[in-house]
C-alpha cells in the first residue's frame, strides 16, 4: 500500500530562514505521481499551495518551492522566507 | 515472473527514425520506472533515458534532442523513438525496469532489474 | 555525460577473492548511494548483481558484495567460480537526467 510520511511531525522555523518540509513515499514510487502539498490553518482550511509541475495555489509562488526527490523518494516543500503567516500544519498527497 | 518484451525492427536506414516497443507481462507496470539503454557491438552500456507511468521523461543530455519516449500504460508498453540516426547509433537496444523495493516498502531507484532480450539494430541503407 | 572508470580486465583463480573499481565524480558516484552493479555472459542481458551500492537483490550470491568510498564503488567478488567469468558493469545514478555507466571490466578466472 501507498504511504506517504512526514519526515517531522513538527518543524520549527525561523522567520525569514528557509525551510524544507519532506514527506517520504512508502510502498511505491514517487516519480510515478503528481504531488500535491496543502497547508490547514487554525480556521480549518485547507489551502492548496503547490502541485507537479510547477503549479502553485494564489499567493504562493513566490514564497514556495515544489519538487521531488528521485534518488530518496521524497516530496520536498520549501518555504524560502518563512513568516509568522506561514504557521500551519502542512499535507503532502499524491493522484496520477 | 515479470518479463519484457522487445519488438521493432532491426534495420534503419540512415537519417530516418528508429522504433522499438517494449510490452510488460507478468507484473505491475505502474510501480516502476522504465529505460531504455544501448550497447554498440564490443562496447559498453549506454543509458538512453527513462519513462515514468505519468509520463513524464528524462532523457541522456547527449541524446535529448533526438530522443522521444512514450508509454501506454493499458497495454503495458513502452516505447522509444531515435531521430535522424547514423551509423553510430548501430547497437543491441535494451528495455529495462528500474527499481527495488525493500520488505519496509523504501524504493531504490537506479537499479535495473529487468531486462528485455535485446534487439540489434543496424543502421545502414 | 562521460564514463565511469573500471580497469579493462581484472583475473584470479578459483577460490580467490577479486576487486573491481569504479571510480566517478562528486557528481555521480560522490553523491548519491545509488551505484549498482550488473554481469554480462557474451550475448546475454545485464544482470543486477548489486544495488544502492551495497545491497543484493534476491538470489544473488552473498560472494558478490559491494562499497563506497568517496567517488570510488567498489565491486568485490570471493570465492572465485568458473561461472564467475564475465563483463562486469558499474552505473551510477548522477542526478533524475542522468545516469552513468562504467566502461566495462572484463573478468577472466584463470
Known amino acids: 500500500a501507498i504511504e506517504l510520511v512526514p519526515e517531522h511531525q513538527t518543524v520549527p522555523v525561523s522567520i525569514g530562514v528557509p525551510a524544507t518540509l519532506r514527506c517520504s513515499m512508502k510502498g511505491e514510487a514517487i516519480g510515478n505521481y503528481y504531488i500535491n502539498w496543502y497547508r490547514k490553518t487554525q480556521g480549518n482550511t485547507m489551502t492548496f499551495i503547490y502541485r507537479e509541475k510547477d503549479i502553485y495555489g494564489p499567493g504562493f509562488k513566490d514564497n514556495f518551492q515544489g519538487d521531488i526527490d528521485i534518488a530518496k523518494n521524497l516530496a520536498v516543500l520549501k518555504i524560502l522566507a518563512p513568516s509568522e503567516r506561514d504557521e500551519g500544519s502542512y499535507y503532502c498527497a499524491c493522484d496520477t | 515472473q515479470v518479463q519484457l518484451q522487445q519488438s521493432g525492427p532491426g534495420l534503419v536506414k540512415p537519417s530516418e527514425t528508429l522504433s522499438l516497443t517494449c510490452t510488460v507481462s507478468g507484473g505491475s507496470i505502474t510501480s516502476y520506472y522504465w529505460n531504455w539503454i544501448r550497447q554498440p557491438a564490443g562496447k559498453g552500456l549506454e543509458w538512453i533515458g527513462r519513462?515514468?507511468?505519468?509520463?513524464?521523461?528524462n532523457y541522456n543530455p547527449s541524446l535529448k534532442s533526438r530522443v522521444t519516449m512514450s508509454i501506454d500504460t493499458s497495454k503495458h508498453q513502452f516505447s522509444l523513438k531515435l531521430s535522424s540516426v547514423t551509423g553510430a547509433d548501430t547497437a543491441v537496444y535494451y528495455c529495462?525496469?528500474?527499481?527495488?523495493?525493500?520488505?519496509?516498502?523504501?524504493?531504490?531507484?537506479?537499479?535495473?532489474?529487468?531486462w528485455g532480450q535485446g534487439t540489434m539494430v543496424t543502421v545502414s541503407s | 555525460s562521460s564514463e565511469l572508470t573500471q580497469p579493462a580486465s581484472v583475473s584470479g583463480s578459483p577460490g580467490q577473492s577479486i576487486t573491481i573499481s569504479c571510480t566517478g565524480t562528486?557528481?555521480?558516484?560522490?553523491?548519491?548511494?545509488?551505484v549498482s552493479w550488473y554481469q554480462q555472459h557474451p550475448g546475454k542481458a545485464p544482470k543486477l548483481m548489486i544495488y544502492a551500492g551495497s545491497k543484493r537483490p534476491s538470489g544473488i550470491s552473498n560472494r558478490f558484495s559491494g562499497s563506497k568510498s568517496g567517488n570510488t564503488a567498489s565491486l568485490t567478488i570471493s570465492g572465485l567460480q568458473a561461472e564467475d567469468e564475465a563483463d562486469y558493469y558499474c552505473?551510477?545514478?548522477?542526478?533524475?537526467?542522468?545516469?552513468?555507466f562504467g566502461g566495462g571490466t572484463k573478468v577472466t578466472v584463470l
Open positions: 519513462i515514468y507511468t505519468i509520463g513524464n521523461t
Open positions: 529495462a525496469r528500474e527499481g527495488y523495493y525493500e520488505s519496509d516498502g523504501s524504493f531504490f531507484p537506479g537499479a535495473f532489474n529487468i
Open positions: 562528486s557528481n555521480d558516484v560522490g553523491s548519491y548511494n545509488l
Open positions: 552505473c551510477s545514478y548522477a542526478g533524475t537526467t542522468n545516469v552513468v
